[in-house]
């Protein structure tokens, strides 16, 4: 993979409750079906129209999934993974990372259309800039009292 | 959004054979579950075979013994073998895809089980 990616991780707790249809979406990973290099862990590939994920909304196409009801993924053959889900009860407790990609280039595991992010930099510099125009506004106003 | 493309289908005489393709888009074809589905004219869309990513397979009972599904994930491909042609075989049949092994109980015959389609390829048994 060419160029730096930055992200922007953050980990969330979903509850969600197992409807008529289950639950409501798709998995891949495992440490027989890396979906992502180097990373044997479990990825939402799907979130099917009108069941449980669908309807809760904050469950995400390319969200990694560390927990089930406190069980670890971690290093789990895809099918056991599947297993864990299907076993686990009408109240499904989920531990999720959400990446967010913040800049051009090669992403870790968006799917098949693969977003483009925002360059950190498109943020960065206005922010730089707006904060040295206040400052020298600041500056000026003081040196006129 | 996976691209399906169907390809093989065609004429041919009862008890005769034809192989369908169904070349697939995207980096992670090995993930994906594969089916057919065939539609007769004036009959609703009928599960014909479908494959899981690891190589298990699912056939609906009237092509049991004579459809053989397979896949080639080198070459982002499913392939339908078809043997002992009936023309109750006639139909357009298509190529499905959805991405991952879905949590809930899986039901291969379900077309809401499947995100992507095809556009179809005609089969004419005579």
């Known amino acids: 993979m060419n160029g730096r990616v930055d992200y922007l991780v953050t980990e969330e707790e979903i509850n969600l409750t197992r409807g008529p249809s289950g639950l409501g979406f798709n998995i891949v990973g495992g440490t027989d079906q890396q979906y992502v290099s180097n990373d044997s862990g479990i990825y939402v590939s799907r979130i099917k129209e009108n069941g449980a994920a669908a309807l809760d909304g904050r469950l995400q196409e390319g969200d990694k999934i560390l927990s089930v009801n406190g069980q670890d993924l971690k290093n789990l053959l895809h099918q056991d993974a599947v297993d864990l889900f299907r076993n686990a009860g009408y109240a499904v407790s989920l531990r999720v990372q959400h990446r967010l990609q913040v800049q051009n280039g090669p992403i870790g595991h968006r799917g098949e259309g693969d977003p483009s992010g925002i360059p950190i930099f498109m943020v960065l510099v206005p922010v730089f800039a707006l904060t040295m125009v206040a400052a020298w506004a600041f500056m000026r106003y003081r040196q006129q009292l | 959004q996976v691209q399906l493309v169907e390809s093989g289908g065609g004429p041919v005489q009862a008890g005769g054979s034809l192989r369908l393709s169904c070349a697939a888009s995207?980096?992670?074809?090995?993930?994906?579950?594969m089916a057919w589905f065939r539609q007769a004219p004036g009959k609703e869309r009928e599960f014909v075979a479908a494959?899981?990513?690891?190589?298990?397979?699912y056939y609906a009972d009237s092509v049991k013994g004579r459809f053989t599904i397979s896949r080639d994930n080198a070459k982002n491909t499913v392939y339908l073998q078809m043997n002992s042609l009936s023309p109750e075989d006639t139909a357009v049949y298509y190529c499905?895809?959805?991405?991952?092994?879905?949590?809930?109980?899986?039901?291969?015959?379900?077309?809401?089980?499947?995100?992507?389609w095809g556009q179809g390829t005609q089969v004419t048994v005579s």
């Open positions: 499905a895809a959805a991405i991952g092994s879905t949590v809930d109980s899986y039901s291969p015959s379900d077309p809401l089980e499947y995100d992507d």
């Open positions: 995207g980096r992670t074809f090995s993930t994906y579950v």
């Open positions: 494959i899981s990513w690891n190589g298990s397979t």
